[in-house]
Amino acid sequence: EVEKTACPSGKKAREIDESLIFYKKWELEACVDAALLATQMDRVNAIPFTYEQLDVLKHKLDELYPQGYPESVIQHLGYLFLKMSPEDIRKWNVTSLETLKALLEVNKGHEMSPQVATLIDRFVKGRGQLDKDTLDTLTAFYPGYLCSLSPEELSSVPPSSIWAVRPQDLDTCDPRQLDVLYPKARLAFQNMNGSEYFVKIQSFLGGAPTEDLKALSQQNVSMDLATFMKLRTDAVLPLTVAEVQKLLGPHVEGLKAEERHRPVRDWILRQRQDDLDTLGLGLQGGIPNGYLVLDLSMQEALS
């Protein structure tokens, strides 16, 4: 806490300008009016204040707005935002996308800090849902943002927002997250034609059920191996050799290099060896010819 001291004669700040960088901490405290600072926050960023001086300016704003800063001030915080704690930010009510962008710009190039995470959380909660413009903004600054959300949080994403998602935004998503996102993507892209639909839905297919993969196999889509390897194992297992061949097209040649990895390994174990042989890749481990395959899950359902 800086001691309350009277401002020396002639040092009272009339405006926020470069002369203030020569002020000692106690002089800033005594000579800068908090209301003046609040109205001229946009100037602070252009002045090379030290970290200690910024601490003083933050302290003045905290005194002026103990319940949290108004958005007019927040929007112009600039580098002062880096001085804010998550507790400070929880007091804010940020509704403007421009304000959000301005603050994310300050943190650009760095990993998501607790302050930024709190800011985003406040912003999204204030809006009620993760709309397209917000998602566009957040993924532009943090490509991994979507995958940092829990499945519960993702459930509030409206299908219309899915149009803003780029393939790289889903790189770190796990199957539980894709399970939530895939139905939304399917809904969002439902009016597109076959090949265009596949290009858009491809990144979300890690959440696709077997019946959708079967349907895709009838559409000459030529799914690449990288996408196939990200499919849910339980969705891949029921596919026949013919369906996988149709689904992958020329990419089926890549199965050989992946035969020891999931889901290919588990899928091979479920296929008849003579069916696997038709792929011409020397895949081994299928059910030997002449063996009877019992579907025990079906048997249980009947009893």
């Epitope: 191996l225 061949q245 990419h251 040649e253 792929l279 890749l281 020397g282």
Partner: antibody, heavy 121, light 107 residues
Framework: QVQLQQPGTELVKPGASVKLSCKAS????????MHWVKQRPGQGLEWIGN????????YYNERFRSKATLTVDKSSSTAYMQLSSLTSEDSAVYYC??????????????WGQGTTLTVSS | DIQMTQSPSSLSASLGGKVTITCKAS??????IAWYQHKPGKGPRLLIH???ELQPGIPSRFSGNGSGRDYSFSISNLEPEDIATYYC?????????FGGGTKLEIK
């Protein structure tokens, strides 16, 4: 050891068709797809397409879809490429190649010696 | 399709010297690149696969490097039998594509 045998030369007239062969030995023919590659005089290598020898299913480079037809005869472990409506542009050396599936879609570890096709009247 | 841009198209070097050839892919090929030596009247000979893995029997004078879209291939201690045309091949996609080739001559 693995061998891919191709006839040395073929001389054909413009407008005709030709069927080039590639006889495989030293490995299980139906465990590796067969690929075909073209090299025009003084030019680089160009991938034509490949064929699954087990079910006869081919895939083509779009540029060769209406020019080449790939087939196999499992009983003789031989792959064929038929080239139709021949012009001087088709004069080239044609190679068959077998991939090794160590990673991704596989690189070619065995090649035939190539068949030199000359299209001339 | 993935395009492979190989350079230079030809080069001349002295015996015992070192040469480097580059291939640039039109997209990330995840190190799935092979290098071949091709002499007239023969099929291409595999030298390197997966960017830098030397084929059995290939001398360590041959080496490869790179990642993403940019790859290089070098021959050090050049010998007379290295006179040939060299090609890169991407196999990150089932529709394989070759670089345009580099013809190596000895000064």
């Amino acid at each position: 050891q693995v061998q891919l045998q191709q006839p040395g030369t073929e001389l054909v007239k413009p407008g005709a068709s030709v069927k080039l062969s590639c006889k495989a030995s030293g490995y299980t023919f139906t465990n590796y797809w067969m690929h075909w590659v073209k090299q025009r005089p003084g030019q680089g290598l160009e991938w034509i397409g490949n064929i699954n020898p087990s079910n006869g299913g081919p895939y083509y480079n779009e540029r060769f879809r209406s020019k080449a037809t790939l087939t196999v005869d499992k009983s003789s472990s031989t792959a064929y490429m038929q080239l139709s409506s021949l012009t001087s542009e088709d004069s080239a050396v044609y190679y068959c190649a077998r991939p090794y599936y160590g990673s991704s879609y596989g690189y070619f570890d065995y090649w035939g010696q190539g068949t030199t096709l000359t299209v001339s009247s | 399709d993935i395009q492979m841009t190989q350079s230079p198209s030809s080069l001349s070097a002295s015996l015992g010297g070192k040469v480097t050839i580059t291939c640039k892919a039109s997209q990330d090929i995840n190190k799935y690149i092979a290098w071949y030596q091709h002499k007239p009247g023969k099929g291409p000979r595999l030298l390197i696969h997966y960017t830098s893995e030397l084929q059995p029997g290939i001398p360590s004078r041959f080496s490869g490097n790179g990642s993403g879209r940019d790859y290089s291939f070098s021959i050090s201690n050049l010998e007379p039998e290295d006179i040939a045309t060299y090609y890169c091949l991407q196999y990150a996609n089932p529709l394989r594509t070759f670089g345009g080739g580099t013809k190596l001559e000895i000064k």
